[in-house]
């Protein structure tokens, strides 16, 4: 099918960075300034994204790829292709409608984004609290009395931090 199409459609020969110009007998013309085509055989070039205002340019637009944006310091990207900027908070806080608020007792957040998560419940694993939790850090679970035999491991590190409650980037 591809071979048949290329025989019939001269536009299929136009590479990325060009478009098939119907006004010029389907000649492959370069994309105009501030536009791009990321695949071959395009009949038009797409307008480059402009990273304006709080959206900063992370990667300039080229004839074959769109610009990429990120957010001004104090905010971070959210959504596909950094379609939104969301406020940073301090460690030990989470973002709410009312702005950044401290984590409630018994919860923590060790990042500038995401939500406060409950401290690990050491007793569920039959362990004791070795280091108390804070707003910024999870508890560290230590051995249960039965684990204090020679050669036993003395500390269980906390589970790796996850970041629930936010759209993927």
């Amino acid at each position: 099918f591809e071979r048949t199409r290329s025989l019939q459609d001269p536009c299929s020969n136009c590479p990325a960075g060009t478009f098939c110009d119907n006004n010029r007998n389907q000649i492959c013309s370069p994309c105009p300034p501030n536009s791009f085509s990321s695949a071959g055989g395009q009949r038009t070039c797409d307008i480059c994204r402009q990273c304006k205002g709080v959206f900063r340019t992370r990667k300039e637009c080229s004839s074959t790829s769109n610009a990429e944006c990120d957010c001004t310091p104090g905010f971070h990207c959210l959504g596909a292709g950094c379609s939104m900027c969301e406020q940073d908070c301090k460690q030990g806080q989470e973002l709410t409608k009312k702005g950044c608020k401290d984590c409630c007792f018994g919860t923590f957040n060790d990042q500038k984004r995401g939500i406060c998560r409950p401290w690990t419940n050491c007793s569920l694993d039959g362990k004791s609290v070795l280091v108390n939790g804070t707003k910024e850090r999870d508890v560290v679970c230590g051995p249960s009395p039965a684990d204090l035999s020679p050669g036993a491991s003395s500390v269980t590190p906390p589970a790796p931090a996850r970041e629930p409650g936010h759209s993927p980037q």
């Epitope: 709080v54 959210l78 379609s83 939104m84 900027c85 969301e86 409608k97 409650g165 936010h166 759209s167």
Partner: nanobody
């Protein structure tokens, strides 16, 4: 196209007042949370205030509570920020920003931003 245009900035003396406006076009203004965000010289962005679609909920950063008032007029597609008792710390570029789809539910991201209006508080 979708656009936000701020106005009303300027030079004001400490203790003075200003009212910022933001004119929205190209989208259904009454369907979105709206925000004011500012950037002081040499600093990062700071969220200032937000307002729900119908104006029934309004929230402020602690440093402006009792001095700034956010409001909106959905009939005029306009957002406002009344700023009283201004101090030098309020000197900044003020941006109007639209809360993205799902704002307040699973995120607080802002997807459309104005070009900003400059407020300078100085004697």
């Amino acid at each position: 196209q979708v656009q936000l245009v701020e106005s009303g900035g300027g030079l004001v003396q400490p203790g003075g007042s200003l009212r910022l406006s933001c004119a929205a076009s190209g989208f259904t203004f009454s369907s979105y949370w709206m925000n004011w965000v500012r950037q002081a010289p040499g600093k990062g962005l700071e969220w200032v205030a937000n307002i729900k679609q119908d104006g029934s909920e309004k929230y402020y950063v602690d440093s402006v509570k009792g001095r700034f008032t956010i409001s909106r007029d959905n009939a005029k597609n306009s957002l406002y920020l009344q700023m009283n008792s201004l101090t030098a710390e309020d000197t900044a570029v003020y941006y109007c920003a639209r809360g993205g789809e799902g704002y307040g539910d699973d995120h607080y991201g802002m997807d459309v931003w104005g070009q900003g209006t400059t407020v300078t508080v100085s004697s």
